[in-house]
């Protein structure tokens, strides 16, 4: 029972985590304009991995995609790659773990096969979570570096005649979503790996083999060796766990005939 619960919970936690990683990757608020120096701005800038957006005084939000590949910073490309790898690994992990779930019967699949699949999906979830955490952390580090660089530029080299306030960017909501989602995927992966240990067959009975020694009529039967993983019992109780993640996008402006790009 405990193994099924651990496996099911691991699956659900990973599912929520991967949905979060996908949401974070798609979100536009990876970096948002720091309003500390300009709290009264009517034009609010924020940026994602794929496009940058500007919310204007009319409430209209204009987003423009990064239509260049070579012109983008290497760090941004690296973050994109990490997030995509995380999503791909997570998606494959989910697919594998569905078939590995103890509560789902697929033909005559042995417990040892399910254990292997559970371990595989667990490792995939762990790597997926690490990719997401790494991607978000690299971006956050990039933001911190740029923030202090622009702060230094703001107060030097202008001879006191500061007319243009340089836009500084701070952490956006997507970073926090990414960190939490990566953490959840990682935890889910660890839970799957733990469940795997309990899924391995509890007993391996070896068939008795007769050894006939010449001149002796003695049969030697080796005793049954008990193989134990030490983690929980292999129960037949079936429990279905359901889980999901839902994200809401509150960007309230949609292109209309009055919008100019």
């Amino acid at each position: 029972m405990a193994v099924t619960a651990c496996q099911g919970l691991g699956f659900v936690v990973s599912l929520i985590g991967i949905a979060g990683i996908i949401a974070a990757t798609c979100m536009d608020q990876w970096s948002t304009q720091d309003l500390y120096n300009n709290p009264v701005t009517a034009v609010f800038n924020y940026q994602g991995l794929w496009r940058s957006c500007v919310r204007e005084s009319s409430g209209f939000t204009e987003c423009r995609g990064y239509f260049t590949l070579l012109g983008l910073p290497a760090m941004l490309q690296a973050v994109r790659a990490l997030m995509i790898v995380g999503i791909v690994l997570g998606a494959i992990g989910l697919l594998v773990s569905i078939f590995a779930l103890k509560c789902i019967r697929i033909g005559s699949m042995e417990d040892s096969a399910k254990a292997n699949m559970t371990l595989t999906s667990g490792i995939m979830f762990i790597v997926s979570g690490l990719c997401a955490i790494a991607g978000v952390s690299v971006f956050a580090n990039m933001l911190v570096t740029n923030f202090w660089m622009s702060t230094a530029n703001m107060y030097t080299g202008m001879g006191g005649m500061v007319q243009t306030v340089q836009t500084r960017y701070t952490f956006g909501a997507a970073l926090f979503v990414g960190w939490v989602a990566g953490g959840l995927t990682l935890i889910g992966g660890v839970m799957m790996c733990i469940a795997c240990r309990g899924l391995a067959p509890e007993e391996t009975n070896y068939k008795a083999v007769s050894y006939h020694a010449s001149g002796h009529s003695v049969a030697y039967k080796p005793g049954g060796f008990k193989a134990s993983t030490g983690f929980g019992s292999n129960t037949k109780n079936k429990k279905i766990y359901d889980g999901g993640a839902r994200t809401e996008d509150e960007v309230q402006s949609y292109p209309s005939k009055h919008d100019y790009v």
């Epitope: 800038n45 940026q47 009319s58 204009e62 309230q252 209309s256 100019y260």
Partner: antibody, heavy 115, light 113 residues
Framework: QVQLVQSGAEVKKPGASVKVSCKAS????????VHWVKQAPGQGLEWIGY????????KYNEKFKGKATLTRDTSTSTVYMELSSLRSEDTAVYYC????????WGQGTLVTVSS | DIVMTQSPDSLAVSLGERATISCKSS????????????LTWYQQKPGQAPKLLIY???TRESGVPDRFSGSGSGTDFTLTISSVQAEDVAVYFC?????????FGGGTKVEIK
């Protein structure tokens, strides 16, 4: 087509309040902020503030805080501006404006404060 | 608050002549996020509401005659009417659309000589 239709002219006594309405049509009401601007006779334009019809969020010019209150009714796509404690210097034409770059303005509402 | 200073206060030009209106802001109106200057020009005819002419300092609103053009960046902006027509008699306002409170220039009255 897009229209912002304001309520008619008002004549009020000093100390009274007035509520001016602005009905929007021809576009998705919750997609754009509705701003208000004051134009005193023969004078320039002064920004009063805006309301976000999507979530009722408001922002005011410091000068008009306590003087103007913006509200909205999404069911009728109407925004209201209430001016309190009227004085003679509040006599002006008040405009509501919306859409990108304020491409559309109401026809204006003349509020006259006279004893 | 950003102060918008328009000059001249009034301008009398002959039909077909060029009219130039200047607008200066006390702070830059250039948004680094999209490299656009958030300065807007409006035309107000007597007894009417202002009408949008130019946004982003130089982009003409659809339906506005091409004799109207805007230029400038940062803090200095110009509205030019290349060949003034009788229907261009109006007051022209520039507006800071970059920072709250949104502020307007004092206006420039264009008349025919």
């Amino acid at each position: 087509q897009v229209q912002l239709v304001q309520s008619g002219a008002e004549v009020k006594k000093p100390g009274a309040s007035v509520k001016v309405s602005c009905k929007a049509s021809g576009y998705t009401f919750t997609n754009y902020f509705v701003h208000w601007v004051k134009q005193a006779p023969g004078q320039g334009l002064e920004w009063i503030g805006y309301i976000n019809p999507y979530n009722d969020d408001t922002k005011y010019n410091e000068k008009f805080k306590g003087k103007a209150t913006l509200t909205r009714d999404t069911s009728t796509s109407t925004v209201y501006m209430e001016l309190s404690s009227l004085r003679s210097e509040d006599t002006a034409v008040y405009y509501c404006l919306s859409l990108r770059f304020f491409a559309y303005w109401g026809q204006g509402t003349l509020v006259t404060v006279s004893s | 608050d950003i102060v918008m200073t328009q000059s001249p206060d009034s301008l009398a030009v002959s039909l077909g002549e060029r009219a130039t209106i200047s607008c200066k802001s006390s702070q830059s109106l250039l948004n680094s996020g999209n490299q656009k200057n958030y300065l807007t020009w409006y035309q107000q005819k007597p007894g009417q509401a202002p009408k949008l002419l130019i946004y982003w300092a130089s982009t003409r609103e659809s339906g506005v005659p091409d004799r109207f053009s805007g230029s400038g960046s940062g803090t200095d902006f110009t509205l030019t009417i290349s060949s003034v027509q009788a229907e261009d008699v109006a007051v022209y306002f520039c507006q800071n659309d970059y920072s709250y409170p949104l502020t307007f220039g004092g206006g420039t009255k264009v008349e025919i000589k």
